[in-house]
Amino acid sequence: MRRERGRQGDSSSCERQVDRVNLKPCEQHIMQRIMGEQEQYDSYDIRSTRSSDQQQRCCDELNEMENTQRCMCEALQQIMENQCDRLQDRQMVQQFKRELMNLPQQCNFRAPQRCDLDVSGGRC
């Protein structure tokens, strides 16, 4: 089907939607994936919840947004921003970013186009 895209709506409404959802399960899920089951990452006590459970909770939270597909970029950027200070080195940043990019697919959403995850002004 051919479609001409009109306006996508405004980004401030996405920011409001992202603010309303709990992104912690997504952050925990990605951290678990890049840390394995290392005990050092226990600030959320993530060891008590299996990664697959966290993934499901993460997908459920993302689904809570009114327009999940359009607001996906803002959600991913917020996750990156939230976790930036916890990422200890450049390699960890790249690993986190790779996992974050895979998140939409894991939740059966399309990956967002034109989404710049380098949002932390060089901190990450």
């Epitope: 479609r3 306006r7 996508q8 967002p112 989404c115 710049d116």
Partner: antibody, heavy 123, light 110 residues
Framework: EVQLVESGGALVQPGGSLRLSCAAS????????MTWIRQAPGKGLEWVAN????????DYLDSVRGRFNISRDNAKSVLYLQMNTLSADDTGVYYC????????????????WGQGILVTVSS | QSVLTQPPSVSAAPGQKVTISCSGT????????VSWYQQLPGTAPKLLIY???KRPSGIPDRFSGSKSGTSATLGITGLQTGDEADYYC???????????FGGGTKLTVL
């Protein structure tokens, strides 16, 4: 070598129509977004329209939406811009460009440009 | 008036360094990638920087790009007289569903 060659520019009266063509060669046309960009005399660059690889998605500058139609023929490697209800504000050089936008986590960028074709709308 | 704001002109002597800023908002530069173009007099524009910081092959490393928050910057070191041109930034705006160009900056090499 990548080449983009525009044609179809002309002097046209206000309210008139024109169709621009852009013949592409030197790359696999069907795998790239394509974009029209224009420049009024002595002014800056202004994006006009994007079209996805398979033609399924199109985006337009607000002031041309409903008047212009971007289309492509992947079999012939040709990009088109049908322009209707033209006004003096549409006068300028129109560039056909290859857009490097990929399917995710990348941005629009125009890595190859045609030489440009002049469209003049005047009575 | 362009939504992306660039200084109308900048100038510097040969061999010096110059920076050109491009200021936007959260719905454009803040969320999306920035590219930069050089337009020499009477010619079609040429891509200098894409995805904020990347250089296409053939573009010398005298040209660099960076982005922080809702602003982007093009840097040019070792200025040459051949760098005299108009420079434009561009990015996607998610609210407008459109590519935006800055108003352009005229670089003069003194």
């Amino acid at each position: 070598e990548v080449q983009l060659v525009e044609s179809g520019g002309a002097l046209v009266q206000p309210g008139g129509s024109l169709r621009l063509s852009c013949a592409a060669s030197g790359f696999k046309f069907s795998t790239f977004y394509m974009t029209w960009i224009r420049q009024a005399p002595g002014k800056g660059l202004e994006w006009v329209a994007n079209i996805k690889q398979d033609g399924s998605e199109k985006d337009y500058l607000d002031s041309v939406r409903g008047r212009f139609n971007i289309s492509r023929d992947n079999a012939k490697s040709v990009l088109y811009l049908q322009m209707n209800t033209l006004s003096a504000d549409d006068t300028g050089v129109y560039y056909c460009t290859r857009n490097g936008l990929q399917d995710s986590y990348s941005g629009d960028f125009f890595d190859h440009w045609g030489q440009g074709i002049l469209v003049t709308v005047s009575s | 008036q362009s939504v992306l704001t660039q200084p109308p002109s900048v100038s510097a002597a040969p061999g010096q360094k110059v920076t050109i800023s491009c200021s936007g908002t959260g719905s454009n530069i803040g969320h999306n990638y920035v590219s930069w173009y050089q337009q020499l007099p009477g010619t079609a524009p040429k891509l200098l920087i894409y995805d904020n910081t990347k250089r296409p092959s053939g573009i010398p490393d005298r040209f660099s790009g960076s982005k922080s928050g809702t602003s982007a910057t093009l840097g040019i070191t070792g200025l040459q007289t051949g760098d005299e041109a108009d420079y434009y930034c561009a990015t996607w705006d998610a609210d407008l569903s459109a590519v935006l160009f800055g108003g352009g900056t005229k670089l003069t090499v003194l």
